[in-house]
Interface confidence: low
């Protein structure tokens, strides 16, 4: 319990601020799973790393905030951080 | 600021080897990937594949696989492409980049010739 | 691999003109990345996350699109446009590019 919220810390917080920007725009369209709301804008925009973590992980709960994490670090191209991220979380 | 400098430019003879290189600073190498495009004269760009320095994976485009390989080394902060076998056809500029933010160097002008 | 076929391959636009260049995708992807490249330099970004304009970009530059349908727009051509355009996918790997569109000025 708490692995995979770290693992999301762990990938947001080396997210440059320009990152952590484009982040939360894929965030605000990336298709979610049925029957999960989406973070509202507002707020989303506002919030650093660890904020979001929470945020990410009350909305999703840990398995599908870090897999949701995961896909849009790929989406961004960061195929190698969206990798370490989900091999942490599936230790 | 941020800076990728890449090597002069290579004259190489067909079926020989050449190792182009990428030396990164201003930043910690080991934070962000670097990857490689190639462009021939009047041409478009393609993607060669990346390498993260940290872990040393590497991430090839399957055209490139038996062409390119990828390497870094951390203690001088600095990327290395090796294209093997050379032919007329590897004659391009061979670009590094920053892999997150897009940095790029300013290329390396590769001829083949006999 | 995915391949993304841009269009026109090369066009002329005179100043104040609207101009749109076109990414088609062979396979769906979530967002588009777009390169300006001019004669005897490195590309530079352009449009990152199909939309946003890299620091710099004039707002006349756009970028829209979806899934496997994406464009780069200018609303006014400058003489300072004319280069040649880039789209790069990079939702899966390899990273392709577009073949690039030439973008001349009238």
């Known amino acids: 319990m708490g692995r995979a919220r770290d693992a999301i810390l762990d990938a947001l917080e080396n997210l440059t601020a320009e990152e952590l920007k484009k982040f939360k725009l894929k965030l605000l369209s990336v298709p979610l799973r049925e029957g999960y709301g989406r973070i509202p804008r507002g707020a989303l925009l506002s919030m650093d790393a660890l904020d979001l973590t929470d945020k990410l992980v009350s909305f999703y709960l840990e398995t599908y905030g870090a897999e949701l994490t995961a896909n849009v670090l790929r989406d961004m191209g960061l195929q190698e951080m969206a990798g370490q991220l989900q091999a942490a979380t599936h230790q | 600021q941020v800076q990728l400098q890449q090597s002069e430019a290579e004259l190489a003879r067909p079926g020989a080897s050449v190792k182009l290189s990428c030396k990164a600073s201003?930043?910690?190498?080991?934070?962000?990937?670097i990857f490689w495009v190639k462009q021939r004269t009047g041409q478009g760009l393609e993607w060669i594949g990346e390498i993260y320095p940290r872990s040393g994976n590497t991430y090839y485009n399957e055209n490139f696989r038996d062409k390119a390989t990828l390497t870094a080394d951390k203690s001088s902060s600095t990327a290395y492409m090796e294209l093997r076998s050379l032919t007329s056809e590897d004659s391009a500029v061979y670009f590094c980049?920053?892999?997150?933010?897009?940095?790029w160097g300013q290329g390396t002008t590769l001829t083949v010739s006999s | 691999q995915i391949v993304l076929t841009q269009s026109p391959a090369i066009m002329s636009a005179s100043p104040g003109e609207k101009v749109t260049i076109t990414c088609s995708v062979s396979s769906s992807v979530s967002y588009m990345y777009w390169f300006q490249q001019k004669p005897g330099t490195s590309p530079k970004v352009w449009i990152y996350?199909?939309?946003n304009l890299a620091s710099g970009v004039p707002a006349r530059f756009s970028g829209r699109g979806s899934g496997t349908s994406y464009s780069l727009t200018i609303s006014r051509m400058e003489a300072e446009d004319a280069a040649t355009y880039y789209c790069?996918?990079?939702?899966?790997?390899?990273?392709?590019f577009g073949s690039g569109t030439k973008l001349e000025i009238k």
């Open positions: 201003g930043y910690t190498f080991t934070s962000y990937g």
């Open positions: 996350s199909t939309s």
């Open positions: 980049a920053r892999q997150r933010d897009d940095y």
């Open positions: 790069q996918q990079r939702s899966s790997y390899p990273f392709t």
